[in-house]
Interface confidence: medium
């Protein structure tokens, strides 16, 4: 029986040429992660498996930073970037559970927002 | 008028600890993601703590064990206790809302790490 819940950081409005953080948060549930995927409708953004580590997709390496945490950063966001994130823990023995995300990213009209950030 | 506004920066020596406030106006803390970033002298501005609606929190690495994310809903106000403060966390702290970098920032509040 699957009794975990995921919490994510819900719907997300941001500005053409930024960063945002995407996570989530999987409780209630002892079962282990074995790997966390991150994709964007049916595009594979990145991968955290627990014995691997990290694996950002090619056509997103530039873009796309691990972390915080499970998390992921993605910067120099465009309009093409709306839409729907998805979180999704692969877990023993429970199996799959998935978090949605929203980001809107709107066209902004300050330059200077477009510096970034690290993350550690 | 949606705003963040930092406090409880100063001198500290080495070992010495700080607690930093964000007071939150316009929105409801509760219905969003809080962080807290620093920007030290010459370097990127860098993610050191957040935390989600329902409390869970994540940190860097090199802040771990020693700074405590929090909220308080009831007063619109985020929190960032710091322990065990070191030179190298000598910075201006913001804190920011929505898991956007530059949605929202306050005016940032410096902690300077010195004997």
């Known amino acids: 029986m699957m009794t975990g819940t995921i919490e994510t950081t819900g719907n997300i409005s941001a500005e053409k040429g930024g960063s945002i953080i995407l996570q989530c948060h999987l409780s209630s549930t002892t079962a282990q992660v074995t790997q966390v995927n991150w994709e964007q409708q049916d595009q594979l953004l990145a991968i955290c498996n627990a014995d691997l580590g990290w694996h950002i997709s090619p056509s997103f390496k530039d873009r796309v930073a691990p972390g915080p945490g499970l998390g992921l950063t993605l910067q120099s966001l465009t309009v093409n970037d709306t839409g729907e994130y998805f979180c999704i823990y692969h877990t023993y023995p429970d199996g799959t559970y998935t978090g949605r995300i929203f980001l809107e990213v709107l066209e902004s009209s300050v330059a200077e927002h477009g510096a970034r950030f690290q993350i550690p | 008028e949606v705003q963040l506004v930092e406090s409880g920066g100063g001198l500290v020596q080495p070992g010495g600890s700080l607690r930093l406030s964000c007071a939150a106006s316009g929105f409801t803390l509760s219905s969003n993601w809080m962080g807290w970033f620093r920007q030290a002298p010459g370097k990127e501005r860098e993610f050191v703590a957040s935390v989600l609606r329902g409390g869970y929190t994540w940190y860097a690495d090199s802040v771990k064990g020693r700074f405590t994310i929090s909220a308080d809903n009831s007063k619109n106000t985020a929190y960032l206790q710091m322990n065990s403060l070191k030179p190298e966390d000598t910075a201006v702290y913001y804190c920011?809302?929505?898991?956007?970098?530059?949605?929202?920032w306050g005016q940032g509040t410096l902690v300077t790490v010195s004997s």
């Open positions: 920011a809302r929505d898991a956007y970098y530059y949605g929202l």
